[in-house]
């Protein structure tokens, strides 16, 4: 019988008695930075090459006995999860192991850095196919470790790391907090976040997705045919490293940005019980459980987008928060969110030659988040068109006036502290989908893009009575690029995209009362690329 | 995910470039920063990663490391260069007393210094 974790990541069309999806990652090399491993275990024999790299601190305590099986336990299990014959995800992947953790599972930032440098030098000396680096370890936030990961990622290496087992915000740990790394949290057979003793999986905006990480059967270093159950975000990260190896083997030219977008796209959505997470982290934590794509080819036609949350701005009056997309991604829209509702909106602005999303806190506000919608749009030419506050009763409006440019997102930003408290709502004139409409005292920013075959449409969902949440989703074949609230609703806390759904959040209705401004309208901009679809059909 | 200027403990030692007769003083107005792990039990004081500015060559890294050793020796401190980084980040790993941090932060090409810390299997 197939172990639960392999069943969970396998799409139904692969599910037979045996887990044998096509091509087991044979074109990919996976580097494992962990403990020593038992390379002659029957699960991984001939699949894992033990490098001569070793950089570990001495074991703590005078009573510590160096037992080979204990020393190899963690690394052997993970190597088995990635590429094991019986219980592995990518059975064809070849692996190389570097020892950066001692027999107690402890290492140093410096030892890990030297290990990453070793991988980069190996890559330069003998370039091979796609590389995946698995970092099943965590320490406190480290600027230097994150910087090293960034450099390696920019050299074309896919890094996958454990979110951490501290039941805490993953952004407080490294390498989990490095934006370029794919950070993985752990879920169990019930798709619940994993509890480990008094702690459990980390969470928050620095987690990219979750994967099976509890009661995972894999190679045991106790003997060459032994198996054991282990748990943790390391096991979850190993699943994603295996999935990444499978995807890269099928499409070796995939960039890190493309791989991350695909991992997110093919994940199971909204299956995790968010009540396990602290209340303030629920909105920031992705409700995604990793899975293999249903077919290894043909995903290229899709317009892929993901949501990136900024760090919290902090409560000072002029505080801002910035959300950034990866270098290969386009920022197609920008929104903001504040739990107190006190914010001064958001705007897209250029920074270092790239657009970023900046949200502004308001006086008395507890702080804001900026939310970027980051998409893969080849040959795109995007720009931001801004209209200053109109001061006219009809409100501020801006549209995409360049030929061939389509509207992908709307943002609004205002200087006044309490926008629209006593102002009537402003409604968009019908039949003008290519423009953004905002409050008369706000400046409005339209994200306008030109890309081959790109088409977009606006979809709205309005609710006349006050409601804590209003949503509008894009239909099958269309991808959500923009999410905002129609102006005039002063009690709106903000808007953000969850997968293909635009969510507009309002204050607790009990405190607002049902007035004319109780009406809340969520506005989604849904796009698709005919060019990508055609290119995909030509390939097939 | 976390920006580089995000949530972690940063100890900024804003130091001017009046170091004793440095041939290559840092550019005016720039100050190197010192970082350490916010989780105290995970700190490993006595070992530091000295990260140099992005375009620094290996030869400059080695020269900077030697300079630190020489200046430390003049003050009666023993230091050991454990590793010189190149390929990913320019810099070096040094075993030294925390007393020398002010001195190290004034060295040419230094971007920031981070105290070593523990990582754990997850």
């Amino acid at each position: 019988s197939i172990p639960w974790n392999l069943e969970r990541i396998t799409p139904p069309r692969y599910r037979a008695d045996e887990y044998q999806p096509p091509d087991g990652g044979s074109l990919v090399e996976v580097y494992l930075l962990d403990t020593s491993i038992q390379s002659d275990h029957r699960e991984i024999e001939g699949r894992v090459m033990v490098t001569d790299f070793e950089n570990v601190p001495e074991e703590d305590g005078t009573r510590f006995h160096r037992q080979a099986s204990k020393c190899d336990s963690h690394g052997t299990h993970l190597a088995g999860v990635v590429s094991g014959r019986d219980a592995g995800v990518a059975k064809g992947a070849s692996m190389r192991s570097l020892r950066v953790l001692n027999c107690q599972g402890k290492g140093t930032v410096s030892g890990t850095l030297i290990g990453l440098e070793f991988i980069r030098k190996s890559q330069l000396v003998q370039p091979v196919g796609p590389l995946v680096v698995l970092l099943p370890l965590a320490g406190g936030y480290s600027r230097v470790l994150n910087a090293a990961c960034q450099r390696l990622a920019r050299a074309g290496v896919v890094l996958v790391t454990a979110a951490g087992n501290f039941r805490d915000d993953a952004c407080l740990y490294s390498p989990a907090s490095a934006p370029e790394v794919i950070t993985v949290g752990a879920t169990n057979a019930q798709d619940q976040p994993v509890t480990l003793g008094t702690l459990g999986t980390n969470f928050g905006r620095c987690v990219d997705l979750f994967a099976p990480g509890e009661d995972i059967i894999g190679a045991s270093s106790d003997c060459s045919t032994c198996f054991v159950s282990q748990s943790g975000t390391s096991q979850a990260a190993a699943h994603v490293a295996g999935i990444a190896a499978m995807m890269l083997s099928a499409e070796p030219e995939l960039t890190l940005a493309e791989l991350r977008q695909r991992l997110i796209h093919f994940s199971a959505k909204d299956v995790i019980n968010e009540a396990w997470f602290p209340e303030d982290q629920r909105v920031l934590t992705p409700n995604l459980v990793a899975a293999l794509p249903p077919s290894t080819h043909g995903a290229g036609w899709q317009l892929f987008c993901r949501t990136v949350w900024s760090a919290h701005s902090g409560p000072t009056r002029m505080a801002t928060a910035v959300a950034r997309c990866a270098p290969d991604e386009e920022l197609l829209s920008c929104s903001s969110f504040s739990r107190s509702g006190k914010r001064r909106g958001e705007r897209m602005e250029a920074q270092g030659g790239k657009l970023v999303c900046r949200a502004h806190n308001a006086f008395g506000g507890e702080g804001v988040y900026a939310i970027a919608r980051c998409c893969l749009l080849p040959q795109a030419n995007c720009s931001v068109h801004t209209a200053p506050p109109a001061e006219a009763s009809m409100g501020t409006r801006v549209h995409c006036h360049q030929q061939g440019h389509v509207l992908t997102g709307c943002s609004s930003h205002w200087e006044v502290e309490d926008l629209g408290t006593h102002k009537p709502p402003v409604l968009r004139p019908r039949g003008q989908p290519n423009q953004c409409v905002g409050h008369r005292e706000a400046s409005i920013h339209a994200s306008c893009c030109h890309a081959p075959g790109l088409e977009c449409k606006v979809k709205e969902h309005g609710i006349p009575a006050p409601q804590e949440q209003v949503t509008v989703a894009c239909e099958e074949g269309w991808t959500l690029t923009g999410c905002s609230a129609l102006p005039g609703t002063s009690h709106v806390l903000g808007a953000y995209a969850v997968d293909n759904t635009c969510v507009v959040r309002s204050r607790d209705v009990s405190t607002t009362g049902s007035t004319s401004e109780g009406a809340v309208t969520a506005v989604a901009i849904c796009c698709r690329s005919r060019h990508l679809a055609q290119a995909s059909q030509e390939l097939q | 995910q976390e920006d580089e200027d995000g949530d972690y403990e940063e100890l900024v030692l804003a130091l001017r470039s009046e170091e004793d007769g440095l041939a290559e003083a840092p550019e005016h107005g720039t100050t190197a920063t010192f970082h350490r792990c916010a989780k105290d039990p995970w700190r490993l004081p006595g070992t530091y990663v000295v990260v140099l500015k992005e375009e620094t060559h290996l030869s400059q890294s080695e020269r900077t490391a030697r300079r630190l050793q020489a200046q430390a020796a003049r003050r009666g401190y023993l230091t050991k260069i454990l590793h010189v980084f190149h390929g990913l980040l320019p810099g070096f790993l040094v075993k030294m007393s925390g007393d020398l941090l002010e001195l190290a932060l004034k060295l040419p090409h230094v971007d920031y210094i981070e105290e070593d810390s523990s990582v754990f299997a997850q």
């Epitope: 009661d215 059967i217 003997c223 | -």
Partner: antibody, heavy 130, light 107 residues
């Protein structure tokens, strides 16, 4: 689905010996600790012994120490209980059960998280009588 | 050795009732407690582990609580299929002990 099938029970005289076997299916057998649990007629459950995945650690209830030996053969996916010096009070239905548990790492140490005995055999009856 | 004491030994109840069974440990076992259900002539079945975690496939009317030395198993609304004997088991160390059992019968 993991299945456990016990065999080897029967009637034996006091002082005699018996060897119980438990056959398991799937690689999951070697992944967990395994236990023997017994139930005397009309009585409650009594844990007898358990054994680690690789057989390197074994534990017994006081009343059987020195008389019973638990062992396992990973190649054959089998668990055994060798019972010597049998007494009348050893009369019971003997179940083999999987001890589902998992290891996870703390900061510099391994921890064990135990879920309980989640898969049981149908039981084999041992009667000790003259 | 740690002793486990269940109460009551026998419990009579009707379909739809809410019932509670208690298990007391002779010393603290943190949350390392499991509950099992056994029907005549059958092997036991795991219901709850780590004092309060519901085993996969077990109906949500079963719940567990407690830590240290006092634990309870609650069935929120008795169904005909729930009449059986229930056992608690401690696993504070690698050697385990069961409670003497609580027989739940139809009133």
């Amino acid at each position: 689905e993991v299945q456990l099938v016990e065999s080897g029970g029967g009637l034996v005289q006091p002082g005699g010996s018996l060897r119980l076997s438990c056959a398991a299916s799937g690689i999951t057998f070697s992944s967990y600790w395994m236990s023997w649990v017994r139930q005397a007629p009309g009585k409650g459950l009594e844990w007898v012994a358990n054994i680690k995945q690789d057989g390197s650690e074994k534990y017994y209830v006081d009343s059987v120490k020195g008389r019973f030996t638990i062992s396992r053969d990973i190649a054959k996916n089998s668990l055994y209980l060798q019972m010597n010096s049998l007494r009348a009070e050893d009369t019971a239905v003997y179940y083999c059960a999987r001890d589902r548990g998992t290891y996870y790492t703390g900061m510099g140490e391994y921890n064990y998280y135990y879920y309980g005995m989640d898969v049981w055999g149908q039981g084999t009856t041992v009667t000790v009588s003259s | 050795d740690i002793q486990m004491t269940q109460s009551p030994s026998t419990l009579s109840a009707s379909v739809g009732d809410r019932v509670t069974i208690t298990c007391r440990a002779s010393q603290s076992i943190s949350s390392w407690l499991a509950w099992y259900q056994q029907k005549p002539g059958k092997a036991p079945k795991l219901l709850i582990y780590k004092a309060s975690s519901l085993e996969s496939g077990v109906p949500s009317r079963f719940s567990g609580s407690g830590s240290g030395t006092e634990f309870t198993l609650t069935i929120s609304s008795l169904q005909p299929d729930d009449f059986a004997t229930y056992y608690c088991q401690q696993y504070n160390s690698y050697s385990y002990t069961f409670g003497q059992g609580t027989k739940l019968e139809i009133k």
